[in-house]
Structure formats: C-alpha cells, structure tokens
C-alpha cells in the first residue's frame, strides 16, 4: 500500500494522532496516540 | 451502501436566500470533511467552502465569504449550504461533496435557479 | 488561493489519438491533483487522484504525472465514449479547480 503524508488542509483532521493518506485506497487514516480511538482520534480511552 | 442525498430543486427570486441539505447514509460525517461546489449552466466547476462537521470549522472561498454559510447537524447526520443575497449568476447546480475517510464522493446535485 | 491553469480550453482529435491536458498551480501542489471527467447532465467522474493513481473501474488508456507546479493528464487512445469536459483539482490547500478542457472527435 503506497502511503504519503496527507495534504496541508488535512492538518487538524486527527485530532490525536498523525494523519496519513492511503494513496491507492483514496483515503485518509488517522494513526493514534495511545489512549485515543475513533476514525480522527476523537475518543478517549483508559 | 454510502451516500449523500441532496435536497430538492428550488426557485428563488434576487435577494432571497436558498438553503440546500446534505443528508448521509452509512457513514458519519463527523468522520469527514463536507465539501460544496457549484457548477453555473455551461460553466465549469467551483469550489465554495468546506465544514469538519467534527469541530464545526468552516473554510469558504474568498468570492463567497459574508454571503455563504455551511453548517451541519450530527445529530441527524446532514450539512447544509446557504446563500443569501442571491442574484442571476447564482443560478447552478450545487453538490455537496464527502472527502477524508474516501477521496471525493459525491451527491447527486441541487439545481437551484435564480430568477425575478 | 492556489490558481489552477488548465489548458487547452478546448480541443479535437480523431478516435485513436493521444490526447494530453495540462494544468499548471501556481505554487507546489505536492502531487495533490486530482483529474475528473464530466458529461453533459451528469455529475463529475473521478478518474485520477495523487497525480496518477487511477479509480477502480476506470481504464488504462488514461493516465496522470507531473510534480511541484506542472501536471499532465493523458490519454493514450482516444475513444468514442471519452467525449467530455475533464477537470482538475488541487486539493493540497483548500481547493481550486482548472478551467476544464471540452475533447471532441474530430
């Protein structure tokens, strides 16, 4: 999976975590700090 | 099955102001990045603005700033666009557009016509 | 803004040519560009994102490339059924679209 990091009007879309776009599935992921979960790392977890 | 459903056509005379509604299906727009565009009859396409219906923050084209306003209501899962002080060249189809977790998936489109 | 210079405006070949659209940022876009193809009552079809990856379902004879300011949308074959208004976007800040380029069959 070819893998960049995504573009500047992403910044802020993870709300804990790095943003990264997923070239050939057309989309954004965010990877998490520890202790957040959700799709943009919204949630808190302990 | 994901989609985004646009509200109806509508007629609006100069000055008035339109409302149009973005409701989604099978995903949750707070996972996302709602964006709108326009595209006027025989005209190319035009970016409006976009909303993160997460934080609520708004980015609009400078063209469209003090006449345009995007919101969204999580709780029934929608975004919407208004334009006030319509006039003629308003007169477009408008689509409302998902970005962030798929690359660009659109709804169907609003015809909203402009004329006294 | 990011300004997006699409041309040719318009354009006419014959079934079998190669076709190239050109659009040019006004500043590095970062490969962020995307390319669609419209017809006339229908809404946009994405056919390329990043510069040059290519949607599922669309066919090989299309094809993307560029980097920094200068991208190129290419295709290799002209068919029938590509008659079309194509458009890009950059989508690096914000979002800006070309002018669009209207290919017709000669």
């Known amino acids: 999976v070819s893998i960049t990091k995504c573009n500047s009007d992403m910044n802020g879309y993870c709300l804990h975590g790095q943003c990264i776009y997923l070239v050939d599935m057309s989309q954004n992921y965010c990877r998490c700090e520890v202790g957040y979960t959700g799709v943009r790392c919204e949630h808190f977890y302990l | 099955q994901d989609q985004l459903v646009q509200s109806g056509a509508e007629v609006k005379k100069p000055g008035a102001s339109v409302k149009v509604s973005c409701k989604a299906s099978g995903f949750n727009i707070k996972d996302t990045y709602i964006q709108w565009v326009r595209q006027a009859p025989g005209q190319g396409l035009e970016w409006m603005g976009r909303i993160d219906p997460l934080r609520g923050n708004t980015k609009y084209r400078e063209k469209f700033e003090g006449r345009v306003t995007i919101t969204a209501d999580t709780s029934t899962n929608t975004a919407y666009m208004e334009l006030s002080s319509l006039r003629s060249e308003d007169t477009a189809v408008y689509y409302c557009?998902?970005?962030?977790?798929?690359?660009?998936?659109w709804g169907q489109g609003t015809l909203v016509t402009v004329s006294s | 803004r990011i300004q997006m210079t699409q041309s040719p405006s318009s354009l006419s070949a014959s079934v079998g040519d190669r076709v190239t659209i050109t659009c040019k940022a006004s500043?590095?876009?970062?490969?962020?560009i995307a390319w669609y193809q419209q017809k006339p009552g229908q809404a946009p079809r994405l056919l390329i994102q990043y510069t040059s990856t290519l949607q599922p379902g669309v066919p090989s004879r299309f094809s993307g490339s560029g980097s920094g300011t200068d991208y190129t949308f290419t295709i290799s074959s002209l068919q029938p059924e590509d008659i079309a208004t194509y458009y890009c976007?950059?989508?690096?800040?914000?979002?800006?679209f070309g002018g669009g380029t209207k290919v017709e069959i000669k």
């Open positions: 976007l950059q989508y690096d800040n914000l979002r800006t």
């Open positions: 500043q590095d876009i970062h490969k962020y």
């Open positions: 557009v998902r970005s962030g977790t798929l690359f660009d998936f």
